[in-house]
Amino acid sequence: IWELKKDVYVVELDWYPDAPGEMVVLTCDTPEEDGITWTLDQSSEVLGSGKTLTIQVKEFGDAGQYTCHKGGEVLSHSLLLLHKKEDGIWSTDILKDQKEPKNKTFLRCEAKNYSGRFTCWWLTTISTDLTFSVKSSRGSSDPQGVTCGAATLSAERVRGDNKEYEYSVECQEDSACPAAEESLPIEVMVDAVHKLKYENYTSSFFIRDIIKPDPPKNLQLKPLKNSRQVEVSWEYPDTWSTPHSYFSLTFCVQVQGKSKREKKDRVFTDKTSATVICRKNASISVRAQDRYYSSSWSEWASVPCS
Amino acid sequence: RAVPGGSSPAWTQCQQLSQKLCTLAWSAHPLVGHMDLREEGDEETTNDVPHIQCGDGCDPQGLRDNSQFCLQRIHQGLIFYEKLLGSDIFTGEPSLLPDSPVGQLHASLLGLSQLLQPEGHHWETQQIPSLSPSQPWQRLLLRFKILRSLQAFVAVAARVFAHGAATLSP
């Protein structure tokens, strides 16, 4: 058993049929010694008396809010949560496996630049009685500070018959050094509590590996004289690190119709302009990637050809 | 050329070669990005490699103030990785294809280090750790980790030279 926060405790249980469970001793936070009784949740049934209460925690029915009283007055509470371990593996029932970029990916994180600011998100089908708490650091043995905000519900989607909820959190490294080569990864830890179930999820990454620039901005087309060719130009996204002579991007320019199966024109360039062939009912799209490190491409920025 | 005395390097040449290094580092092991090597207990390998750190003057302001600190750090790293790529880790079994990008990568690391430090001038170089994996699978894992780390190192070096070529070239 360990303390998650004040008056909230996590009991770690090996979860299998007829498991013996864990013996837990609760102590009432009071100077009183006599006349103390214990109850669980809303029940008035007295579970025991005395300053301590010893219980055998085997299942969710044994978890919950234990309260010690004296003469009708509440002295203190202890909330017991369960953390299940099945076949040596901690349960991951609360969050959905996003399966990208690999199986068992519960947390996904992205950064728009090298400033040390990043966003992580996760998915669940649970809509109520759900809380998250996020901590982060650079490195684990001698951790350097990363400050994370509160996790918030950022999107709701209907997937087949059930709803899916996306939560996200923004974090900022306290003393970021955008130009340095990272040697210690960022660690992100998410505590998830659903009713009386506790689970924790972690992710470890370098900012450089989660970079995904915003799409290029200000796409403009200039038809070339006596030709079907068009000069397309664009600018670096505002959110990208500066100066651009140092933090350079490379671009992919594509001309395509509505369907992915349609014929297309495509060219890669380090410049902020390119010449392509425009067709009626097609769109010109441009996306960006770090020039020197193969992290994710941005989403496409698009303008119609006509 | 960047010599210990403090003259300027051939920024444009360094830019071209460092960008080539980036391409080669990813070609040498493109799939390394799909392996989570941190799960494999990284400490003994990548803690020993020279990283370009915050105080090394490789940020735009530091380069403007005095590029020598940064160039010396990059030079150290190039020599370090050049030695690693020429070591038993890469020459031993399982043997690399004769024409694998690792060969070009090795040559280009040497080429860039010589652009930065001509013959006869000497900057301090970092000792290479004695990493001699006994099993081929250990060697393979070590190669992945070294290349992964090299990808990050050459990305910073390429940014430095691109910025230098754009803003510090005479």
Epitope: R228, Q229, K263, V267, F268, T275, I277, R279, K280 | -
Partner: antibody
């Protein structure tokens, strides 16, 4: 299966014109760009130009402007290359290509050998 | 026009050897470079697109890398069916141009 059937080899006199055909099967040429590429005996490849059969748009390499004319007939699913004022320099194999992407050549015809005699 | 220089002009190898073919552009072309194989009396066929992207149906022994001005096509353990000519082609700007080719022949 995507295939391109090119017209047979031809021997033509210097100064004459010739029209080569390239008929597609297994796909509709409107969904592709059609390119023509020239290869002289024991030599490299030269790009002549492309046509978008959907709208008739064409683009020629400067070297072939005035020498080559590309057309397409979507009803017969065929692209054509007409070469005029032939000289010995035009003796070559001419390949047609069908391309989903404009700038590289993924489906090649077998080629038509054109020999110009004086 | 962008000029592509291929080297060597001829490469004599034994089946089982691994080889690298080089293509150098007269100016930077990012990764807009494609490789073709042409066997004797056959049409060319696309091997690699955009410097390193593989093409379905092409054996995995063919790989490409490079960007800017220097590009390489590698054949890991040459097989007898690989003999022929190899061309690079740039798609960075019009007109599209090809290299003069490298002939891969039996030693």
């Amino acid at each position: 299966e995507v295939q391109l059937q090119q017209s047979g080899a031809d021997l033509v006199r210097s100064g004459a014109s010739i029209k080569l055909s390239c008929t597609a099967s297994g796909f509709n040429i409107k969904d592709y760009y059609m390119h023509w590429v020239k290869q002289r005996p024991e030599q490299g490849l030269e790009w002549i130009g492309w046509i978008d059969p959907e709208n008739g748009d064409t683009e020629y390499a400067p070297k072939f402007q005035g020498k080559a004319t590309m057309t397409a007939d979507t009803s017969s699913n065929t692209a054509y290359l007409q070469l005029s004022s032939l000289t010995s320099e035009d003796t070559a194999v001419y390949y047609c290509n069908a391309c989903k992407e404009l700038r590289y050549f993924d489906v090649w015809g077998a080629g038509t050998t054109v020999t110009v005699s004086s | 026009d962008i000029v592509l220089t291929q080297s060597p002009a001829t490469l004599s190898v034994t089946p089982g050897d691994s080889v690298s073919l080089s293509c150098r552009a007269s100016q930077s072309i990012s990764i807009n470079l494609h490789w073709y194989q042409q066997k004797s009396h056959e049409s060319p066929r696309l091997l690699i697109k955009f410097a390193s992207q593989s093409i379905s149906g092409i054996p995995s022994r063919f790989s490409g890398y490079g960007s800017g001005t220097d590009f390489t096509l590698s054949i890991n353990s040459v097989e007898t069916e690989d003999f022929g000519r190899y061309f690079c082609q740039q798609s960075n700007s019009w007109p599209l141009t090809f290299g003069a080719g490298t002939k891969l022949e039996l030693k």
